[in-house]
Interface confidence: low
């Protein structure tokens, strides 16, 4: 062991200087004192491998992994991270120790993992292993649950491949429509992975962990229900499992159910049937169609037929990648100050989207509701009649969608005035955007009715404040006008507002606000 070098591994934490994020490793950072990582030879390892204590880093934190090598002569080195070789420039400190550094700026999940440092000195070769992980929840995932048939049993297993291990629950409801809302007394929850009672009206499985809750509904065709006006549609991605349940109730057992895909019976092993008598002695049959991992050729019309009920179909569409279909053209609305109004986005998406509404850099929760035609809708009503730009943003892991809305509130202008040494300016919001007049107040015109025809410069909509347009008008003053009162008036279809300004020395001198409606 005499030939082995003395190795010291340290972690240096940096306080991020936001202005220099993403710069090279030499960017100026405020550093905290180095922490020793207790580098030690790894037992039972092939070759000379040193291992540092696992480094836990907060997301967005910046760190340096540093190795100090007390070995004579030159050293050469190579960092390897996730199969990729990274440049390595050793230097020597005042104590003539070799120093090798790896700077990780603004830690993200992709930078977590094993950092290997291969060092070659004149005496020996050795490897140093750093394991870098993100502290706490950032490695957590929450995936939508899916169904599997339990081996040798008529039961469904609900699976959600999530970290940390999620709590899985079945959410069952035996009534129709609105009464199956989450907190309704008609809803029964079972905190278990396996479900044997598969005859209910509405069956969902939900998984929850620290990141929230995700649910999947068991797609069902009920032959006793009036078919929807539009054909129900089920989207799946290649490789996902397909489950469709067909349910029918009849006065006795003398009926059977069958599944067909595009008029061809499903293969043996891709369906199973269950039946039971209900409390009123009618027979309930359910027939599941399932594919453990769908391919493109599983797309088509799945039809459930019964000898005693009209058949019903669903269109199953298999896509390579998730999607969000909606019109992304921006929409402008103008409403009165007390008019009730909601923004609305109608979209079709798979997998289900997560969405937000944003106004003035603030985000608002986004609710979505399924419609009968397979589309969903998200509405936003909480605008509090504030004019400006509203943004709807949706994503689902495979696709992103953004739609802009502009809300204009019809109201009469309100004028703000200011004056400088050389000009007087008035600005106004109000919608529709106002037009301007300037009047001079003089002995001849004490009521300020004398038009100022020259030196006026109108700028419409030159400034956007969160999407709200502002109109302004500027009067360039001549020497002859100094000392006079002038009046600027903004008018639109809802009224007029004026402001009187003394053309004097620099500084705002608006006074006497007239308001003529």
């Amino acid at each position: 062991n005499q030939d082995l070098p003395v190795i010291k591994c340290v972690l240096i934490n940096h306080k991020n200087n936001d202005s220099s994020v993403g710069k090279s490793s030499s960017y100026p950072m405020v550093s905290e004192s180095p922490e020793d990582l207790g580098c030690a030879l790894r037992p039972q390892s092939a070759g000379t491998v040193y291992e540092a204590a696992t480094v836990e880093v907060d997301v967005s934190a910046s760190i340096t992994l540093q190795v100090l090598v007390d070995t004579p002569g030159n050293i050469s080195c190579l960092w390897v991270f996730k199969h990729s070789s990274l440049n390595c420039q050793p230097h020597f400190d005042v104590q003539n120790r070799g120093v090798v550094s790896m700077v990780i700026l603004k830690m993200t999940e992709t930078q977590a993992g094993e950092y290997l440092l291969f060092i070659q000195s004149e005496a020996t070769n050795y490897t140093i292993l750093f394991t870098v992980s993100i502290r706490n929840t950032l490695l957590f995932t929450l995936r939508r649950p899916y169904f599997r048939k339990m081996e040798n049993q008529d039961a469904l297993v609900c699976i959600s491949e999530s970290v940390p291990e999620p709590i899985v629950e079945w959410v069952l409801c035996d009534s129709q429509g609105e009464s199956c809302k989450e907190e309704s007394p008609a809803v029964v929850k079972k905190e278990e992975k396996v479900l044997h009672e598969l005859f209910g009206t509405d069956i969902r499985c939900c998984a929850r962990n620290e990141l929230g809750r995700e649910c999947t509904r068991l797609f069902t065709i009920d032959l006793n229900q009036t078919p929807q006006t539009t054909l129900p549609q089920l989207f799946l991605k290649v490789g996902e499992p397909l489950w469709i349940r067909c349910k029918a109730v009849h006065v006795n057992h003398g009926f059977g159910l069958t599944w067909e895909l595009e008029n061809k019976a499903l293969e043996e092993g891709s369906y199973f049937e269950m039946s039971t008598y209900s409390t009123n002695r009618t027979m309930i049959r359910i027939l599941f169609a399932f594919v453990s991992s769908v391919a493109r050729n599983d797309t088509g019309y799945y039809t459930c037929s019964s000898s005693k009920h009209p058949s019903q179909s669903a269109l199953v569409t298999i896509v390579e990648k998730g999607f969000i279909n909606a019109t992304n053209s921006s929409e402008d609305y103008e409403i009165d100050q007390y008019e009730e109004f909601c923004f609305s986005v109608r979209f079709k998406a798979y997998p289900q989207i997560r969405c937000t509404w944003t106004f003035s850099r603030k985000s608002f929760p986004c609710e979505q509701k399924g419609l009968d035609d397979g589309y969903s809708v998200s509405k936003f009503c909480n605008h509090k009649h504030q004019p400006g730009e509203y943004i709807f943003h949706a994503e689902n892991g495979d696709a992103q969608f953004t739609k802009m809305f502009t809300l204009n509130i019809r109201r009469k202008p309100q004028v703000l005035a200011e004056a400088s040494a050389s000009q007087a300016s008035c600005s106004s919001d109000g919608y529709p955007l106002p037009s301007w007049t300037w009047k001079k107040c003089s002995d001849k015109s004490p009521n300020c009715t004398e038009d100022i025809p020259e030196g006026v410069w109108n700028r419409k909509a030159n400034r956007k404040v969160f999407g709200q347009w502002v109109s302004s008008s500027t009067l360039n003053m001549s020497e002859a006008m100094k000392g006079f009162l002038v009046k600027c008036c903004a008018y639109n279809s809802l009224g007029t507002s004026c402001e009187t300004i003394l053309l004097n020395s620099p500084g705002p001198f608006p006074f006497i606000q007239d308001s003529i409606s």
Epitope: G47, K82, H83, S84, S85, T110
Partner: antibody, heavy 124, light 107 residues
């Protein structure tokens, strides 16, 4: 379905630069933990791994050839390009590209799909 | 670099025979090993990954075993379509390295 297709010159003169393209379909390097390797096989000889690239642009090269190789991907992430400088007759081989898939639990599946290969002859 | 030594370099066998091919790594590679089959003029095809897991669609007469440095590929009952060259690949450390192949010929 997943396919990889190699293309490039069939004949290259010594000292020239060889550029090979692997065109991907059925998958792309958009997806996290997806990668493509280049492998070659001189006539009647063994397989030799040359280089690979991952979707996040991580790259690795054969130790003996790394000074002559460059691997890259195009902006559409459906093509991977390998360039080899200063070719020599010993570089005559069938060049293959093959897919790598990285799985969530941390292991990687190497070369589940291969291209059909393109024979490159280095001769004056 | 890790060397992968395959043996034998060739073998003759008859249909129905049990065939065993060995791959030895110059240092431990855990189970980071795959087996590939190549027929003349064709690209290799993956048979086994993670030392012992059978690739989907590959007949169950193929099996893999081993861990660390010693690995074997076994064909329990050789079929006419199995006459080919077989390669092992280690992907434990870079550079990735292949064995130099075992050619299985008809006796």
């Amino acid at each position: 379905q997943v396919t990889l297709k190699e293309s490039g010159p069939t004949l290259v003169k010594p000292t020239e630069t060889l550029t090979l393209t692997c065109t991907l379909s059925g998958f792309s390097l958009n997806n996290a933990r997806m990668g493509v390797s280049w492998i070659r096989q001189p006539p009647g000889k063994c397989l030799e791994w040359l280089a690979h690239i991952f979707s996040n642009d991580e790259k690795s090269y054969s130790t003996s050839l790394k000074n002559r190789l460059t691997i890259s991907k195009d902006s559409s992430k459906t093509q991977v390009v390998l360039t080899m400088t200063n070719v020599d007759p010993v570089d005559t081989a069938t060049y293959y590209c093959a897919r790598i898939v990285g799985y969530g639990s941390g292991w990687y599946g190497f070369f589940d799909y291969w291209g059909q290969g393109t024979l490159v002859t280095v001769s004056s | 670099d890790i060397q992968m030594t395959q043996s034998p370099s060739s073998l003759s066998a008859s249909v129905g025979d049990r065939v065993t091919i060995t791959c030895r790594a110059s240092q431990g590679i855990r189970n980071d090993l795959g087996w590939y089959q190549q027929k003349p003029g064709k690209a290799p095809k993956r048979l086994i990954y993670a030392a012992s897991t059978l690739q989907s669609g590959v007949p169950s007469r193929f099996s893999g075993s081993g861990s660390g440095t010693e690995f074997t590929l076994t064909i329990s009952s050789l079929q006419p379509e199995d006459f080919a060259t077989y390669y092992c690949l280690q992907h434990n450390s870079y550079p990735l390295t292949f064995g130099c192949g075992t050619k299985v010929e008809i006796k």
